[in-house]
């Protein structure tokens, strides 16, 4: 059945209630320099209205503080209002390592990111940090790596490992949840001139992730005790016509090409899904495509296999798909899939359909295919035109969280966290934010607050409190970490 009645119940006490932000551009200098200037000034208020320095007088200055960054102050204010336990944000690789290697490290950028994390911890908000967050508009690579063919060049994976190591070293004492790459399975939108470009870039992204995970596992995990994964774009697929076998096969093929493409090598076999490899090969044999998935060596399979500590999924909607044979040597045509927009469904301005039961089906599919592992939904949300009373977002959050709760309570899926996308909207972009681009709060914040404080949708008489020891432990850890490195 698609929809089942709402359930009453709660998520576990250690559930991560998060909010996701995309790339945080570091502020290059703290924006409150007035506290670091030791001079005394007299303001000529009635004359030329200028400040005149008083010679021979030196004042005590205070050391620079994280909250001198105006941007950080704004984020903290928003996060405090969200009442979340976790904040997921992405670093800007190109800002941290402008040359693409460790020859020029932007220490100020790292200080900025450290401040974001440490100030969040003071509010009881832990960070989930994404190392690399490409978007359709911006590949986000340091220029020299872009110039050297970007993700078509295997050496970009090695450069990523070096960058990841730097971030683990500089931030890993405070950060316990890491995402190496956000939605590598969506870079097919950029590396799209041919299927072989798409699959070649994807291969190097997989290797990049695996190298970073292996480095963390070997060098940093013993002391930092964190967890590392990568976030996959994971929309669910349903047959457009449930009575057509070819549509069912198309739906499963969508999941193989979209999710299993990256999940199978990392979570399971070290190699690409057999179904995907065979489908592409059969099109190749029939002269319909010249695409081919890369052949992996035994060493590459060993490198990739098992390099995830948890499963991280970005889920937004469900797609209705049908089979349509497409000629051409591109990823999109290799799949032989057409999408159907169901106009009867509640949809957002960008045509995202609100189909809550899809997330539960996705979570069950992942467990069935990849075993019983910890799963985080690392981004989930919808665009809503409303600037104040964003009712569509409230409806979306309520219904999707209901389905996640069913997966936890009924299906026994080990769901560990839900991160709503996203904290603040960007100017002239679809409105996904809980806050407007000029930091005005929307009413969905109160709704999310209520779900968080109730830990879900409890029975009327059930307590939303978690045991005191657990809360205290987390707080002690936070304080310890904050004190360890200012």
């Amino acid at each position: 059945k698609e929809s089942t009645p709402d359930v009453q119940g709660q998520f576990p006490c250690d559930f991560s209630w998060g909010v996701t932000e995309s790339v945080l551009k570091p502020e290059s200098v703290a924006s409150s320099p007035q506290f670091s200037d030791p001079h005394l000034y007299v303001w000529n208020a009635t004359g030329n209205r200028l400040l005149h320095r008083v010679e021979g007088v030196r004042l005590k200055t205070r050391p620079a503080q994280c909250t001198d960054f105006v941007n950080i102050k704004k984020q903290l204010e928003m996060l405090a209002r969200m009442k979340v336990t976790h904040y997921r944000f992405a670093l800007d690789w190109a800002s941290v390592l402008p040359t693409g290697n460790l020859s020029a490290v932007n220490r100020q950028a790292l200080r900025y990111y450290r401040c974001v994390v440490s100030e969040g911890l003071k509010l009881g908000i832990s960070a989930m940090v994404t190392l690399y967050y490409p978007t359709h508009a911006h590949l986000g690579l340091p220029e020299p790596l872009l110039h050297a063919d970007g993700w078509l060049n295997p050496s970009t994976a090695e450069a990523f490992q070096a960058y990841a190591g730097l971030c683990f070293q500089e931030l890993g004492d405070l950060v316990k949840l890491w995402i190496t790459i956000n939605e590598p399975n969506r870079l097919s939108d950029i590396y799209n001139r041919s299927g072989n470009d798409t699959y070649g870039a994807a291969h190097n992204l997989l290797v990049a992730h695996a190298l970073a995970w292996r480095l963390y596992d070997r060098q940093f995990r013993p002391s930092q005790r964190g967890a590392v994964s990568l976030s996959l774009h994971a929309d669910w697929a349903e047959p457009a016509n449930p009575y057509a076998d070819s549509h069912w096969r198309a739906a499963e093929r969508f999941l193989q090409f979209e999710i299993a493409w990256f999940a199978e090598p990392l979570f399971k076999t070290g190699d690409y899904p057999a179904a995907m490899r065979e489908y592409i090969a059969s099109k190749h044999r029939r002269g319909l495509s010249s695409s081919a998935l890369p052949r992996l060596t035994e060493a590459e399979r060993r490198l990739l296999k098992g390099t995830v500590d948890f499963c991280a999924l970005n889920h937004f909607t469900t797609r209705f798909v049908m089979h349509e044979q497409l000629a051409g040597s591109r990823y999109d045509s290799d799949r032989d899939i057409q999408f159907l927009q169901d106009i009867t469904r509640l949809s957002s301005p960008t045509r995202l359909a609100v189909i809550p039961w899809g997330v539960r089906k996705l979570l069950r599919w992942v467990r069935r295919n990849y075993g019983d592992m910890d799963i985080y939904i690392t981004a989930s949300g919808i665009d809503d035109q409303a600037l104040e009373d964003d009712r569509l977002r409230k409806y979306y959050l309520g219904k999707y969280l209901q389905e996640v709760l069913k997966a936890y309570l009924i299906d026994k899926v080990r769901i560990k966290g839900y991160y709503a996308f996203k904290l603040a909207e960007e100017k002239s972009k679809p409105r996904f934010g809980f806050f407007t681009s000029d930091f005005k709060a929307k009413s969905s914040i109160q709704f999310y607050n209520k779900v968080i404080s109730s830990r879900g949708f409890p029975f009327e008489n059930s307590s939303s409190r978690c045991s005191q020891t657990q809360e205290n432990t987390e707080c002690t850890v936070c304080l310890f970490l904050v004190q360890k490195k200012p």
Partner: antibody, heavy 120, light 111 residues
Framework: QVQLQQSGAEVKKPGASVKVSCKAS????????INWVRQAPGQGLEWIGW????????KYNEKFKGKATITRDTSASTAYMELSSLRSEDTAVYFC?????????????WGQGTLVTVSS | DIVMTQSPDSLAVSLGERATINCRAS??????????MHWYQQKPGQPPKLLIY???YLESGVPDRFSGSGSGTDFTLTISSVQAEDVAVYYC?????????FGGGTKLEIK
Amino acid sequence: QVQLQQSGAEVKKPGASVKVSCKASGYTFTSYDINWVRQAPGQGLEWIGWIYPGDGSTKYNEKFKGKATITRDTSASTAYMELSSLRSEDTAVYFCARSDYYGSRSFAYWGQGTLVTVSS
Amino acid sequence: DIVMTQSPDSLAVSLGERATINCRASKSVSTSGYVYMHWYQQKPGQPPKLLIYLASYLESGVPDRFSGSGSGTDFTLTISSVQAEDVAVYYCQHSRDLTFPFGGGTKLEIK
């Protein structure tokens, strides 16, 4: 290492056509654009157009539409540029150069150039 | 299409002196967070050679006396201390829109 080897000099009469070749080696031919650039005697560089060998798609400078036709033979890892209805002002050195669609799109590798002389 | 205008047309500089070449685009050559502006050097009888890519990044093997700067529409190639082997014609080029026009060129000579 990456190399682009161009065909030899050509002398043609006005109204004739000429086909210049550019053989690529040292990389995957189908993954990078091949561009053609013209340089008339004592003049600057003029971009003519590019071809993506992966699927044969092309883009031309408006000025050279109808004058230049760029093709490729993937089995020979070779790109071609044919110039039709030659006139004396087409006398120039023609270069091929590789660019990367996903990268900076700069021309890091060049052929040695082919001199085409149009004279009656 | 974006038009590239280089200045000056020619430039005479003493050995060891600084040389500056300018390039102006008719509209911004920045997109997707990258600045698609490049500089080339061409010596007589040779194909051009890439010096600077993406406005300010030195191509490998190019001496670090060459540098590039600028953003949006205005760009500069600087040679901090001109050497005899730098005598050449220098071209700017943009690659923002998958069309790749060059500037008119600047001839550098030794005084």
